[in-house]
């Protein structure tokens, strides 16, 4: 029986050109994490394998950095990075756990208008 739960960074709104950290944390299970995959839509961004370490997909090498931990750092954000990201935990003996994070990347012109957050 799969008892674990995945906690994520939560959805993130960021500006074009900036960088953000995507993180997931698997809790409430003693299962062993064998590999974590990071995907956007149907594209594989990166893999962190317990034995082999990190592999970043060639098309993302310039803008994706491994870590911190099992997380992923996205740099030089573009509006095309807007979308849903998945952290997929492969575990033994539980199986697969998936977390979802939505990233919204705003053009500076859009970020300056509409629903703006007050800075305390």
């Amino acid at each position: 029986m799969m008892t674990g739960t995945i906690e994520t960074t939560g959805n993130i709104s960021a500006e074009k050109g900036g960088s953000i950290i995507l993180q997931c944390h698997l809790s409430s299970t003693t299962a062993q994490v064998t590999q974590v995959n990071w995907e956007q839509q149907d594209q594989l961004l990166a893999i962190c394998n317990a034995d082999l370490g990190w592999h970043i997909s060639p098309s993302f090498k310039d803008r994706v950095a491994p870590g911190p931990g099992l997380g992923l750092t996205l740099q030089s954000l573009t509006v095309n990075d807007t979308g849903e990201y998945f952290c997929i935990y492969h575990t033994y003996p539980d199986g697969t756990y998936t977390g979802r994070i939505f990233l919204e990347v705003l053009e500076s012109s859009v970020a300056e208008h509409g629903a703006r957050f007050q800075i305390p």
């Epitope: 994520t8 939560g10 959805n11 993130i12 993180q23 095309n80 994070i101 859009v110």
Partner: antibody
Framework: EVQLQQSGPELVKPGASMKISCKAS????????MNWVKQSHGKNLEWIGL????????SYNQKFKGKATLTVDKSSNTAYMELLSLTSEDSAVYYC??????????WGQGTTLTVSS | DVVVTQTPLSLPVSFGDQVSISCRSS???????????LSWYLHKPGQSPQLLIY???NRFSGVPDRFSGSGSGTDFTLKISTVKPEDLGMYYC?????????FGGGTKLEIK
């Protein structure tokens, strides 16, 4: 002025499919995410999913995966939601809603769907 | 999915009253950057829902200052300082920090 104009009410038979449109005007269509929301029995609101007009990316509520398909036509600034294999449970009012920083700042007027034989 | 519980279900008021609506979530709505995507909407009969408050406490453009939002973590409140006739309708909170976004069950603000 931001406006989201939805297609009119629909009466369809069980098992059929139908497509609702949401035409955006008064802003840069590709700069904002478009969401779809279901309102059943005049009360409960449920998020169906969203589409990113800029790159066509989608995100769905698992409950509506296989039920709803979201698309956009950038040339006409229009978002679409197709609902498949309709049953009486799908009878509801459906809204499109633009979002910015994860709040739904402008909504369409709603499209009433009635599924009945 | 995050469960959002709104209370009360119904709120009978007299014009001029001050009222509060509560919204509680099953987990914290602050993301890792400390931002909370919690918003409030008013849905009047025959109209579309309209955004009142975003990011816990920010009033959307054109929303009167009698509406205010507060809270943090899992506990949030919408206050109307002086209820007016045009405020009657269904109020909903929405959490959009965690996928999928989820709405509260609604609070009906009605005349006593």
């Amino acid at each position: 002025e931001v406006q989201l104009q939805q297609s009119g009410p629909e009466l369809v038979k069980p098992g059929a499919s139908m497509k609702i449109s949401c035409k955006a005007s008064g802003y840069s269509f590709t700069g904002y995410i478009m969401n779809w929301v279901k309102q059943s029995h005049g009360k409960n609101l449920e998020w169906i999913g969203l589409i990113v007009p800029n790159n066509g990316g989608t995100s769905y509520n698992q409950k509506f995966k296989g039920k709803a398909t979201l698309t956009v036509d950038k040339s006409s600034n229009t978002a679409y939601m197709e609902l498949l294999s309709l049953t009486s449970e799908d009878s509801a009012v459906y809204y499109c809603a633009r979002s910015l920083r994860f709040s739904f700042d402008y909504w369409g007027q709603g499209t009433t769907l009635t599924v009945s034989s | 999915d995050v469960v959002v519980t709104q209370t009360p279900l119904s709120l009978p008021v007299s014009f001029g009253d001050q009222v509060s609506i509560s919204c509680r979530s099953s987990q914290s709505l602050a993301n890792s950057y400390g931002t909370t995507y919690l918003s409030w909407y008013l849905h009047k009969p025959g109209q579309s829902p309209q955004l009142l408050i975003y990011g816990i406490s920010n009033r959307f453009s054109g929303v009167p200052d009698r509406f205010s939002g507060s809270g943090s973590g899992t506990d949030f409140t919408l206050k109307i300082s002086t209820v007016k006739p045009e405020d009657l309708g269904m109020y909903y909170c929405l959490q959009n920090t965690h996928q999928p976004p989820t709405f509260g069950g609604g609070t009906k603000l009605e005349i006593k």
